[in-house]
């Protein structure tokens, strides 16, 4: 077993006075392992959205190649983020608001060719990165779904699903489904096509809605659908509200697998002040479900800091030359290059969290229990069987707080120890690896802690 480090010495029951039947010492002293759940690839880590390939490509050497080829060149960087899938595009031909000139089977030459895309798929597969294609039809136009020609569009989508599944994509995304009439039944049909090809393929639907009832009605008829929405962006960034949103959602969806993001497409900085970015990264990576990020979230990319850049798709800041429009507007600590060299950067935090999320059983598929920790705080435990357990404590407030962890809220299977080791803090200055007394836990403003402790029988 993953969590047992002692040797399995085979001894016989005869040694114990019974009939001869080989059993292990482990069977004698450890409880039976809980059976591992079946996990799909999108359960094992984060998804990374690249809605605008040209903006992601940036300036400089990136401009040497068509965006799809350029993206292939960035795969090693994406591997370093340990993301499990890329959500790309849309990249199909779409003349604004013109159904006849929208072809979901053709790649817009501005992005590259079908050959480039095939090459990207091959390279991504070699690096164990999956590719999800966004097929939102009228992405350049006013209404993403050409509201007046729903049936024509739905047929185009069906044909596109079959075409791109054959081409080797790992899944699809459709956004703005609040603008799609009869969305639930169309999604059910598209889900059938996708899953009919292979259970290993994924359909993601995105909505701008933050209304739980609307979200639940979309999920009702689609059991394996992954839905991104604006649900969490309504939190008002307070601990209590976020806790209630998360627990409400999990209870209402019957603990089915879900995704966590603040919107269907936009950057975290569209919703959060800079001081909360680390806290939200920690939360998104440790809630039960698939975290979904947009390119640039790992560095805190902020369109508002880049004059003239579109809010929904600012240029990716690879290095200081990425935004030549205004010399000096970009400092090293805003860029991938600068943050890669700084162990205390947001990017370094993202990498560490992504690494933990993709390898720890308790974070991969562990149970989740939220419990009271005092006003302004959101805290929860993730645990799986006899594996290492994780405690997350988040201070959304502007003031330092002492945490009053109410262990009495927790079931017996998830009890808290007196001390837990600090795996990481979102703020500098704490000694990682040091044991912290949970009764005396104090958090700085906007600080999040990830603590770990062993299973105790």
């Amino acid at each position: 077993h993953h969590h047992h480090h002692h040797e399995q010495k085979l001894i016989s029951e005869e040694d114990l006075g019974g009939e001869q039947k080989l059993i292990s010492e482990e069977d004698l002293r450890a409880p039976r392992c809980r059976e591992l759940p079946a996990q799909k690839w999108w359960h094992t880590g984060a998804l990374y959205r690249i809605g605008d390939l040209q903006a992601f490509q940036g300036h400089g050497a990136g401009n040497l190649a068509a965006p799809i080829s350029g993206l292939k060149g960035r795969l090693d960087y994406l591997s370093s983020l340990k993301v499990k899938g890329l959500v790309l595009g849309p990249i199909h031909k779409n003349q604004k608001d013109d159904v006849a000139q929208t072809d979901l089977l053709q790649i817009d030459p501005n992005f590259g060719s079908k050959e480039d895309f095939d090459s990207l798929l091959q390279s991504a597969k070699k690096k164990s990165i999956r590719v999800i294609l966004d097929l939102t039809p009228n992405y350049r136009g006013e209404n993403s779904w050409f509201s007046t020609q729903v049936d024509t569009v739905a047929t185009k989508v069906k044909d596109a699903l079959e075409f791109w599944l054959q081409a080797g994509v790992d899944g699809f995304q459709v956004r703005d489904i609040e603008n799609l009439k009869d969305a639930s039944s169309f999604l059910a049909e598209w889900q059938n096509i996708t899953k009919g090809f292979s259970e290993d393929r994924l359909l993601i639907a995105g909505t701008n809605s933050s209304d739980l009832q609307q979200i639940l009605s979309l999920l009702e008829s689609n059991k394996d659908l992954l839905l991104t929405s604006s649900y969490l962006s309504d939190s008002g960034s307070t601990g209590e509200h976020t806790k209630s949103l998360v627990t409400q959602y999990l209870n209402a969806t019957g603990n089915r697998w879900c995704s966590w993001s603040l919107s269907q497409a936009r950057l975290l900085t569209s919703f959060l002040p800079a001081q909360l970015l680390r806290l939200y990264q920690l939360m998104l990576f440790t809630l039960p479900g698939t975290p979904v990020f947009s390119y640039g979230d790992e560095i805190g990319l902020d369109a508002a800091a880049l004059p003239g850049q579109p809010m929904e798709a600012p240029v990716m800041l690879w290095d200081e030359s990425s935004f030549p429009d205004i010399p000096g507007a970009v400092s090293a600590n805003m860029t991938v290059k600068g943050q890669s060299e700084d162990p205390g950067s947001l990017l370094s935090l993202f990498r560490r969290l992504s690494d933990q999320r993709s390898k720890e059983r308790s974070l991969l598929h562990g149970d989740f229990h939220a419990f009271s920790a005092g006003p302004g705080l959101f805290s929860y435990i993730r645990h799986w069987d006899q594996n290492e357990r994780f405690l997350v404590v988040l201070n959304f407030g502007d003031v330092g707080l002492s945490a009053g962890l109410q262990a009495s809220d927790l079931p017996a299977s998830a009890s808290l120890p007196a001390k837990a080791d600090l795996l990481l803090s979102t703020q500098p200055g704490r000694e990682e690896g040091s044991p912290l007394e949970l009764e005396r836990l104090k958090l700085e403003p906007h600080e999040g802690l990830l603590l770990r402790f062993p299973y105790a029988a």
């Epitope: 400089g60 050497a61 990136g62 401009n63 040497l64 190649a65 068509a66 799809i68 080829s69 350029g70 292939k72 060149g73 960035r74 795969l75 090693d76 960087y77 370093s80 030459p109 590259g112 060719s113 050959e115 480039d116 690879w318 290095d319 991938v336 290059k337 890669s340 060299e341």
Partner: antibody, heavy 126, light 108 residues
Framework: QVQLVQSGAEVKKPGASVKVSCKAS????????ISWVRQAPGQGLEWMGW????????NYAQKLQGRVTMTTDTSTTTAYMELRSLRSDDTAVYYC???????????????????WGQGTLVTVSS | DIQMTQSPSSLSASVGDRVTITCRAS??????LNWYQQKPGKAPKLLIY???SLQSGVPSRFSGSGSGTDFTLTISSLQPEDFATYYC??????????FGQGTRLEIK
């Protein structure tokens, strides 16, 4: 399969210009960049510059700035390198090479040259 | 500009020998280093990219290592067809792209 086929050898007088072509086939021409690299007799390799066949962006080596122009014709999938005001030390074999991008941990893009033309000898002599 | 210095500039070896060529950058280039082989009258051929990744179709006797400023190309067991000139190339700080001056590998 990917091929880059260059124009034939040229002999030029000092002060003249030369235009070398590089016809690409076997891949989507507009999806990659083309670099030009030269090699004087018995010497090493010297990068001259690149052009993006995707958008026409160019970047030239500092020492050649003002004398070199790189262009592409997407209809014929051909790249061109013109060098003006030729001097005797421009005598070299000129290569075109396809530039493929790759990145590392810090997101910086590296460029490798995965396919090369056969080379064009340009001799500058009075 | 980043300078690339190869050593030795030439070496003699026999078939079956293990050979190492080094390349030093004047400043850190992370792992952005490629190796090429060039035979007389022919265009260079890519062997290794990103310091240690083998280009497809290149025999596994070629390997690369290093990062920062110091890099090596190793040929584990020289074959007759390996006698050629080898160049390193950096592309970390581009433009400009710069090559090493070359290492000529001759038959002993």
């Amino acid at each position: 399969q990917v091929q880059l086929v260059q124009s034939g050898a040229e002999v030029k007088k000092p002060g003249a210009s030369v235009k070398v072509s590089c016809k690409a086939s076997g891949y989507t021409f507009t999806s990659y960049g083309i670099s030009w690299v030269r090699q004087a007799p018995g010497q090493g390799l010297e990068w001259m510059g690149w052009i993006s066949a995707y958008n026409g962006n160019t970047n030239y080596a500092q020492k050649l700035q003002g004398r070199v122009t790189m262009t592409t014709d997407t209809s014929t999938t051909t790249a061109y390198m013109e060098l003006r005001s030729l001097r005797s030390d421009d005598t070299a074999v000129y290569y075109c090479a396809r530039g493929e991008l790759y990145s590392g941990y810090d997101g910086t893009l590296g460029i490798l040259f995965d396919y090369w033309g056969q080379g064009t000898l340009v001799t500058v002599s009075s | 500009d980043i300078q690339m210095t190869q050593s030795p500039s030439s070496l003699s070896a026999s078939v079956g020998d293990r050979v190492t060529i080094t390349c030093r950058a004047s400043q850190s280039i992370s792992s952005y280093l490629n190796w090429y082989q060039q035979k007389p009258g022919k265009a260079p051929k890519l062997l290794i990219y990103a310091a240690s990744s083998l280009q497809s179709g290149v025999p596994s006797r070629f390997s690369g290592s290093g990062s920062g400023t110091d890099f090596t190309l190793t040929i584990s067991s020289l074959q007759p067809e390996d006698f050629a000139t080898y160049y390193c190339q950096q592309s970390y700080s581009t433009p400009p792209i710069t090559f090493g001056q070359g290492t000529r590998l001759e038959i002993k």
